[in-house]
């Protein structure tokens, strides 16, 4: 679809005479006729079969023809076309005196004729315009033409419909060809796939408008490239998406499990030493002068029994004073006066002289300690029972009782329970983090296997000629009751004749 | 906001044992570095600390009381225990559970619940 | 252990007036491990102050404290009605944690 343009511009008829040779009265009112047509190598009378176009009186004898696109849009002339431009046509313009104001054909002398010229060609679809003239005897017309597409048909032969849009269906504007050209942002045949945010992974995001990065179930991020872990998921990491490896240091479905409690909450205060000892479970061995789980509190100065050979001791503001007993001195009470004839040492410890008599020391029995064996041994004062053990003097001796699931001299060791072999009937035994499950064997059942459950020995009918089948539930084994003339476990040889023999 | 409830008998015989619970709400047992604490306060006078535990299981008591305390942790309902051994009419006494984050000042408290030992 | 003593027992002052309350300890309360809680009658002890100095949440700022070693101080700016009620110190930088007897604030 297009329109063939024709721009008249100038039209001389100095003499003021029609094509006869007759002149017109009072001069020649003249308007044109334009027939345009398909190709033809000698132009004949006959259909504009491409269009025709009449203009109202322009002038009289000579005139040139104003512009007049923006007025009535008369000139140039408009011949539309709704049909591929063939790029040929033939083209006629007759020039005409108008007597009166009636324009018509039939409402015309034969003799109105001007002039009548005739031309063919090839014309492309283009913007420039074609300037001619054309001279006969007595007139002489200068004119331009062209053929452009109408709005939204574009290439060589206005064939190719292209209307611009920017809505679901595509965003884009027309090319000279009428080829796409896609708005910013968008892409594909027909402009209707946005272009996604720079670095938008192609696989795991998508977008519905340009720059945007939309995630797939079990991706997140700006660009969608980070999987997201299992829900729940606490120190651990995924390559695909509801993945949860675990960090170091962290076990458990969920990774939550720490296994390495001491690097991750730096518990122990104080400078003490931290012992990992099982999951999220620790031990803090405390500097001298400190107490508590997390040796986060100092021991009264008094408490660390500073005071020898059974002095007392005072706390004070800026420390501790020892009140010694009668015969010693000193910072600790650590210096005697005393010796062995004195009989200092206590709960039967026996008393051996040093530097010639000036001194003595006292070699204590067992349970017993101090310079004057004056102190009953606490063996538990160091805190020996490991994982929240219980400790206990025996005697000479400590122990330590300990908590479910630990065990050894110091409650040092993780007990397994499946270390007992607490399943019954074979049943197979796994640890589990709060206690152990058994699976257990066909015929039991129980959470350690110790209930029988009674298998049906019968279920498989084993017994033949129509025997009654009873379970035997003490032995899970079948007991076939025979009809009359059946014998056998199964009821299955015929009770008569006897065996035939081959003798 | 995180509470503290105790709960347990209010009245004990002379020489049984004093048992109390204490439930943690709107915060985990096991999170955090809490020191979960009992105090008690005998009627009239001032507060003792009894001593505390951790999620862990372990505890510190006060020296005074250690021969007869015991404390234990349940994290899967979210509460901690108290027992005290072989009381007396001297236990008698409010007890209360409180929370000590990360040192030992004490932020949250219990309502405390009163508890006569009495024949 | 360590002893905490308080004064005075008793502190007769009336609203809007400037209160100040004097806790010693027996030994030195290393880092300024000491807190002040407030006890009304029926109720539970509510922590005012921690680390000598620090205010717990949602304390006013009329509570204050102050103090380091052996001699620790709250400080009540301007009295209000709510304020006359049973005062406690604590120590907790030694084993076992310790708390003064008390000093009890009643309007004049």
């Known amino acids: 679809s297009g329109v063939f343009q024709l721009q008249l511009q100038e039209f001389i008829n100095e003499r003021g005479v029609l094509a006869s040779g007759r002149p017109c009265e009072p001069g020649c009112r003249t308007f044109f006729r334009v027939c345009l047509k398909h190709f033809q190598a000698v132009v004949s009378p006959g259909p504009c079969t491409f269009g025709t176009v009449s203009t109202p009186v322009l002038g009289t004898n000579s005139f040139a023809v104003r512009d007049d696109s923006s007025g009535g849009g008369r000139n140039p002339l408009q011949l539309p076309f709704n049909f591929t431009w063939p790029g040929t046509f033939s083209l006629i313009i007759e020039a005409w005196h108008a007597p009166g104001d009636d324009l018509r054909p039939e409402a015309l002398p034969p003799d109105a004729l001007i002039s009548k010229i005739a031309i063919q060609g090839s014309l492309a679809v283009g913007q420039n315009w074609l300037l001619d003239e054309q001279t006969s005897t007595l007139t002489r017309l200068r004119y331009s033409y062209r053929v452009i597409c109408s709005d939204n048909y574009y290439g060589d032969n206005c064939s190719r419909l292209c209307k611009k849009r920017n809505d679901h269906f595509g965003h884009y504007v027309c090319q000279p060809d009428g080829n796409l050209s896609c708005l910013p942002g968008w892409t594909g045949e027909y402009c209707q796939q946005p272009i996604c945010l720079s670095g938008c992974h192609e696989q795991n995001g998508y977008c519905s408008k340009p720059a945007e990065c939309l995630c797939r179930p079990g991706w997140q991020g700006r660009l969608c490239n980070e999987c997201i872990p299992h829900n729940g998921c606490r120190h651990g990491t995924c390559s695909t998406p509801w993945q949860c490896t675990c960090d170091e240091g962290w076990g458990g479905l969920f990774c939550d499990q720490d296994l390495n409690y001491c690097t991750h909450h730096s518990p122990c205060k104080n400078g003490a030493t931290c012992s990992n000892s099982g999951q999220r479970s620790y031990t803090c061995t405390c500097r001298p002068g400190y107490t508590g789980v997390d040796c986060e509190l100092e021991l009264s100065e008094c408490d660390s029994n500073p005071c020898r050979n059974g002095g007392s001791c005072k706390d004070q503001e800026d420390g501790y004073h020892c009140l010694c007993p009668p015969g010693y001195y000193g910072l600790h009470c650590e210096h005697s006066t005393l010796s062995c004839a004195d009989s200092p040492c206590f709960n039967g410890g026996s008393c051996r002289e040093r530097n010639q008599g000036a001194n003595y020391a006292c070699e204590c029995p067992p349970n017993f300690t101090g310079s004057n064996c004056e102190k009953k041994v606490d063996r538990c004062t160091s805190n020996p029972c490991a994982n929240g053990g219980q400790c206990l003097n025996r005697g000479p001796s400590r122990m330590c009782r300990c908590r479910p699931g630990f065990t050894g001299t110091y409650c040092e060791l993780h007990v397994s329970d499946c270390a007992r072999n607490p399943c019954a009937h074979g049943g197979t035994c796994h640890d589990l983090e709060n206690g152990l499950m058994c699976t257990c064997p066909a015929g039991f059942s129980g959470r350690r296997c110790e209930v029988r459950t009674s298998i049906d020995a019968c279920a498989s009918s084993p017994c033949f000629n129509r025997a009654t089948c009873y379970t035997d539930l003490s032995t899970d084994t079948f007991v076939c009751n025979c009809p009359y003339g059946f014998v056998g476990s199964r009821c299955e040889f015929p009770v008569g004749l006897p065996p035939s023999f081959p003798w | 906001q995180v509470q503290l409830q105790e709960s347990g008998p209010g009245l004990v015989k002379p020489s049984q044992t004093l048992s109390l619970t204490c439930t943690v709400s709107?915060?985990?047992?096991?999170?955090?570095?809490?020191?979960w604490t009992w105090i008690r306060q005998h009627p009239g006078r001032g507060l003792e600390w009894i001593g505390y535990i951790k999620y862990t299981g372990s505890a510190h008591y006060n020296p005074s009381l250690k021969s007869r305390v015991t404390m234990s942790v349940d994290t899967s309902k979210n509460q901690f225990s108290l027992k005290m051994t072989s009381v007396t009419d001297a236990d008698t006494a409010v007890y209360y559970c409180a929370r000590a984050p990360g040192s030992h000042s004490f932020d949250i408290w219990g309502r405390g619940t009163m508890v006569t030992v009495s024949s | 252990d360590v002893v905490m003593t308080q004064s005075p027992g008793t502190l007769f002052l009336s609203p809007g007036e400037r209160a100040t309350l004097s806790c010693r300890a027996s030994q030195s309360v290393s880092s300024s491990y000491l807190a002040w809680y407030q006890q009304k009658p029926g109720q539970a002890p509510r922590l005012l102050i921690y680390?000598?100095?620090s205010r717990a949440t949602g304390i006013p700022d009329r509570f204050s404290g102050s103090g380091s070693g052996t001699d620790f101080t709250l400080n009540i700016s301007r009295l209000e009605p709510e304020d006359f009620a049973l005062y406690y110190c604590q120590q907790y930088s030694r084993s076992p944690i310790t708390f003064g007897q008390g000093t009890r604030l009643e309007i004049k």
């Open positions: 680390g000598a100095s």
């Open positions: 709107s915060d985990s047992i096991s999170s955090g570095n809490n020191y």
